[in-house]
């Protein structure tokens, strides 16, 4: 593993055999809203006379409070081995990210491999179309942008029903409408593996010159 | 989404030369941005990675060759300070495969640019 | 770092036939393992990410397994178009470091 050995300094502690966390899953892949578990374990013989609890850890923060973590003791001759149970019911795109436990041994840190945990769901808007007053038979613009994962994210174009493009856009895509005569609606379809999205309807308004 | 690199050419040895590349569509202070390079006939080699934050990591091997730097909201720069002939190579420039402000992350590629040629010879 | 070792260097089969290539991990890297594929010309393309998952859009009859330091492709149903080059890659990071590294490839030729 790439995880710290503990290293101490008195000659006594220098004989005692490396603790590590041991191998578990590595890259999670799942639906938004389904549940999770993963876990990690370690070893610790007998020779090891302090040892703090296992803390959880998501890009780099301590996870504290509400979040469903169980440990659990399992002592023999040798010496004790603990498992940290790690659960999230009906994962959102919030639970992407890397977690990792870490725990002190004689004063030493010792971290885990990393569990990177992907959600997947439907394409998410992070930029949508915008109503805007035109002026009669002038150019504008109109911008759509959705991420997943999964990837790629298409985008069609729809104006009063009616898709704009036969062939999809990668996400982001601008639509340059050469002009138009009367009011119209505006919107976008994102399309990933999981289905499809539709951004809000906007309202593109004909200026009125007095 | 897409990349484009950019700045390949034919130098000689020793000459610095630096890599530009180009993305349209990708917020690089969501993604990171790695360097690959492939040699005449062989196979992949990873330089480094620049991660969303800023942090740069590399290949044992690229520590002191190569430097990655973002340069702009658009623009990620590989500079390779001492180019010798093996330096010889299509360098690739890729998108890491998650968003997300993190300096570690599972970074498999996910968008590739079409490469520029650098060609090192006396 | 890790060192990916991927066989066969080559491999030859007919149209509808099935190949088999594998990676080798020189330390276990879990399942952070993708494959790619890479025509002349043209840049790498994802196949498989987290050793078994299929990247968009990438017909089924791909298919990766393995974990900690042994990793297969499999690809069946063999079609002209799949003669290309594929490579493996590691993806492990802790939380300190990333270690990223491409196997050496295999040129699939399909006959």
């Known amino acids: 593993a790439h995880t710290a050995a503990p290293q101490v300094t008195s000659t006594a502690s220098k004989l005692l055999p490396p603790v590590a966390f041991n191998h578990t899953i590595g890259h999670i892949v799942l639906s938004e809203h389904k549940n999770v578990k993963f876990n990690c374990s370690i070893n610790i013989p007998n020779t090891y006379q302090e040892t703090a609890g296992i803390s959880w850890w998501k890009d780099g923060k301590e996870l504290l409070g509400a979040h469903h973590s169980i440990t659990q003791f399992y002592p023999d001759e040798e010496g004790v081995s603990i498992i940290a149970l790690f659960s999230i019911a009906s994962v959102q795109r919030s639970d992407n990210g890397s977690y990792f436990c870490k725990m002190k041994v004689n004063n030493r840190e010792i971290v885990s491999d990393p569990i990177y945990v992907e959600v997947q769901g439907l394409p998410y808007f992070i930029k949508q179309p915008e109503s805007v007053n035109v002026t009669r038979n002038t150019a504008f613009n109109l911008t759509c942008q959705a991420v997943g994962p999964p990837e790629p994210v298409n985008i069609f174009w729809v104006q009063n029903s009616s898709r704009v493009n036969e062939k999809p856009e990668r996400s982001p895509s601008v639509l340059t409408v050469p002009g138009l005569t009367e009011t119209a609606v505006f919107s976008c379809e994102a399309h990933n593996d999981k289905g499809l999205t539709v951004s809000k309807g906007v309202h593109i308004n004909i200026k009125v010159i007095p | 989404q897409s990349l484009e690199e950019s700045g390949g050419r034919l130098v000689t040895p020793g000459t610095p030369l630096t890599l530009t590349c180009t993305v349209s569509?990708?917020?690089?202070?969501?993604?990171?941005l790695g360097w690959v390079r492939q040699a005449p006939g062989k196979g992949l080699e990873y330089i480094g990675i620049i991660s969303s934050t800023g942090t740069t990591y590399y290949a044992t091997w690229a520590k002191g060759r190569f430097t990655i730097s973002k340069t702009s909201s658009t623009t990620v720069d590989l500079k390779i300070t001492g180019p010798t002939t093996e330096d010889t190579a299509t360098y690739f420039c890729a998108r890491g495969a998650y968003a997300g402000y993190v300096a570690f992350g599972p970074y498999y590629f996910h968008i590739w640019g079409p490469g520029t040629l650098v060609t090192i010879s006396l | 770092d890790i060192v990916m070792t991927q066989t066969p260097a080559s491999v030859e089969a007919a149209v509808g036939g099935t190949v088999t290539i594998k990676c080798q991990a020189s330390?276990?890297?879990?399942?952070?393992l993708a494959w790619y594929q890479q025509k002349p010309g043209q840049p790498p393309k994802v196949l498989i990410y987290?050793?078994?998952h299929l990247a968009s859009g990438v017909p089924s009859r791909f298919k990766g397994s393995g974990s900690g330091t042994q990793f297969t492709l499999t690809i069946s149903d063999l079609e002209c178009a799949d003669a290309a080059t594929y490579y493996c890659?590691?993806?492990?990071?802790?939380?300190?470091?990333?270690?990223?590294?491409f196997g050496g490839g295999t040129e699939v030729v399909v006959r």
């Open positions: 890659q590691s993806y492990f990071y802790s939380s300190t470091s990333i270690y990223n590294a």
């Open positions: 569509g990708i917020d690089l202070s969501s993604y990171a």
């Open positions: 330390q276990s890297i879990s399942n952070f």
């Open positions: 987290a050793a078994s």
